[in-house]
Amino acid sequence: IWELKKDVYVVELDWYPDAPGEMVVLTCDTPEEDGITWTLDQSSEVLGSGKTLTIQVKEFGDAGQYTCHKGGEVLSHSLLLLHKKEDGIWSTDILKDQKEPKNKTFLRCEAKNYSGRFTCWWLTTISTDLTFSVKSSRGSSDPQGVTCGAATLSAERVRGDNKEYEYSVECQEDSACPAAEESLPIEVMVDAVHKLKYENYTSSFFIRDIIKPDPPKNLQLKPLKNSRQVEVSWEYPDTWSTPHSYFSLTFCVQVQGKSKREKKDRVFTDKTSATVICRKNASISVRAQDRYYSSSWSEWASVPCS
Amino acid sequence: RNLPVATPDPGMFPCLHHSQNLLRAVSNMLQKARQTLEFYPCTSEEIDHEDITKDKTSTVEACLPLELTKNESCLNSRETSFITNGSCLASRKTSFMMALCLSSIYEDLKMYQVEFKTMNAKLLMDPKRQIFLDQNMLAVIDELMQALNFNSETVPQKSSLEEPDFYKTKIKLCILLHAFRIRAVTIDRVMSYLNAS
């Protein structure tokens, strides 16, 4: 058993049929010595008396808010949460496996630039009685500071018969140099509590590997005389690291109709303009990627051909 | 300890092409190592990230773009002294700081070159003959060093008398390649910045 925060404790349980469970001793936070009784949750049934209460925690029915009283007055609370371990593996029931970029990916993180700011998100089908707490650091043995905000519900989607909820959090490395060469990864730890179930999820990454620039901005078209060709130009996104001659991007320019199966024109360039063939009912799209370290491409920025 | 903005003429920077080749060569070699050594811990997640140039050169700090010198997190107090006559300096007005930067890059390349050559000598003794260093990568390191053209003491190639542990050598190769790729990215960024300045 360990303390998650003040008066909230996590009991780690091997979860299998007829498991013996864990013996837990609760101590009432009071100078009083006698006349103390214990109850669980809203029940008035007295579970025991005395300054300490020893319980055998085997299942969720044994978890909850234990309260010690004296003469009708509440002295202190202890909330017990369960963390299940099945076949040596901690449970991951609360969050959905996003399966990208690989199986057992529960947390996904992205950074728009090298400033040390990044966003992580996760998915769940649970809508109520759910809380998250996020911590992060650079490295684990001698951790350096990363400050994370509160996790917030950022999107709701309908997936078949189920509703899916996306939560996200923003973090910022306390002293980040955009030009630095990372040797220690960022560690992100998310504590998830659903009712009386506790789970924790972690992700480890280098900022350079989670870079995904914003789409290029200010796409403009200029038809070329006596030709089917069009010159398309754009600018670096405002959120990208500067100077741009140091943090350079490369671009993919594509002309395509509404369907992905339609024919297309595609060209890659390090410049902020390109010449392509425009077709009726097609769109010109441009996306960006770090020129020197191939992490993710940005989303497309698009303009219609006509 | 940073790069001034008014430096060489655009397009007159002979090292840009070599640095692009360097990044390409080390990336290809790393990809080849990951594929060939698939049953060894050779991915970014599996290896320890070591920097053989740590406390010996200060390329990131010496080559910091002017715009980032206002960022206190970028200003590390490490100082290293370097020799300062390089042929990539395409203008006589080039400052001492830029010479320091390019000299630091040269020292990085020299250190990695020695490590890679030593390692290749060991790998050539491996009866499995599983992986060797790409001669193209070694040639590209050499070309960039020649383009930088700094006079510097030659570092003797390390020779070891004991029987090489090929498993450890291959893991060290992965560690070196990952670190060298990251340094090659920095070098490419620096050359691009100087070329645009």
Epitope: R228, E262, K263, R279, K280 | -
Partner: antibody
Framework: QVQLVQSGAEVKKPGSSVKVSCKAS????????LHWVRQAPGQGLEWMGW????????EYAPKFQGRVTITADESTSTAYMELSSLRSEDTAVYAC???????????WGQGTLVTVSS | DIVMTQSPLSLPVTPGEPASISCRAS??????LHWYQQKPGQAPRLLIY???QSISGVPSRFSGSGSGTDFTLTISSLQPEDFATYYC?????????FGQGTKVEIK
């Protein structure tokens, strides 16, 4: 299985024209760009131009501009390349090639030898 | 027009040995570079597109690398069926242009 089948070999006199056909089978004809590339004996490949069969849009290499005409007939899934004012240096194998991507070629015809000789 | 220069023009190789063909562009073409194989009397066959992207059905011994002006086609271990002429082609701008070809022959 997508195939491009070209017309047979031709012998032409200098100053005349030649029209080579390329019939596509497998896949929808208008879903692909169609190009013509030639290869003189013992020489490399030379791109001549492309057509979008969907709308008839064409683009030609400056070297052939004014001398080459590429057309397409959607009803028969056939593309044509006509080269006029032939000279002996136009002796080559002319091949059609196609792709959903405009700028490179994933399927080629077998080629048509055009010999220009007086 | 962008001029594509291949080297060597002729490459004698022992079967089972690796082979590398170089292609250089007269100006930077990013990764807009494609490789073809042509055997005598046959149409060219696309091997690699956009410098390094492999084609399904093409053996994994063929790989491409490069960007900017310098590109390489590598055959890791030459098989008897690989003896042919190889062409690079740029698609950075029209007109599309090819290299002169590299003939890989048995040593």
């Amino acid at each position: 299985q997508v195939q491009l089948v070209q017309s047979g070999a031709e012998v032409k006199k200098p100053g005349s024209s030649v029209k080579v056909s390329c019939k596509a089978s497998g896949g929808t004809f208008s879903d692909y760009y169609l190009h013509w590339v030639r290869q003189a004996p013992g020489q490399g490949l030379e791109w001549m131009g492309w057509i979008d069969p969907e709308n008839g849009d064409t683009e030609y290499a400056p070297k052939f501009q004014g001398r080459v005409t590429i057309t397409a007939d959607e009803s028969t899934s056939t593309a044509y390349m006509e080269l006029s004012s032939l000279r002996s240096e136009d002796t080559a194998v002319y091949a059609c090639a196609r792709n959903k991507e405009l700028r490179y070629f994933d399927v080629w015809g077998q080629g048509t030898l055009v010999t220009v000789s007086s | 027009d962008i001029v594509m220069t291949q080297s060597p023009l002729s490459l004698p190789v022992t079967p089972g040995e690796p082979a590398s063909i170089s292609c250089r562009a007269s100006q930077s073409i990013s990764i807009n570079l494609h490789w073809y194989q042509q055997k005598p009397g046959q149409a060219p066959r696309l091997l690699i597109y956009f410098a390094s992207q492999s084609i399904s059905g093409v053996p994994s011994r063929f790989s491409g690398s490069g960007s900017g002006t310098d590109f390489t086609l590598t055959i890791s271990s030459l098989q008897p069926e690989d003896f042919a002429t190889y062409y690079c082609q740029q698609s950075n701008s029209f007109p599309l242009t090819f290299g002169q070809g590299t003939k890989v022959e048995i040593k």
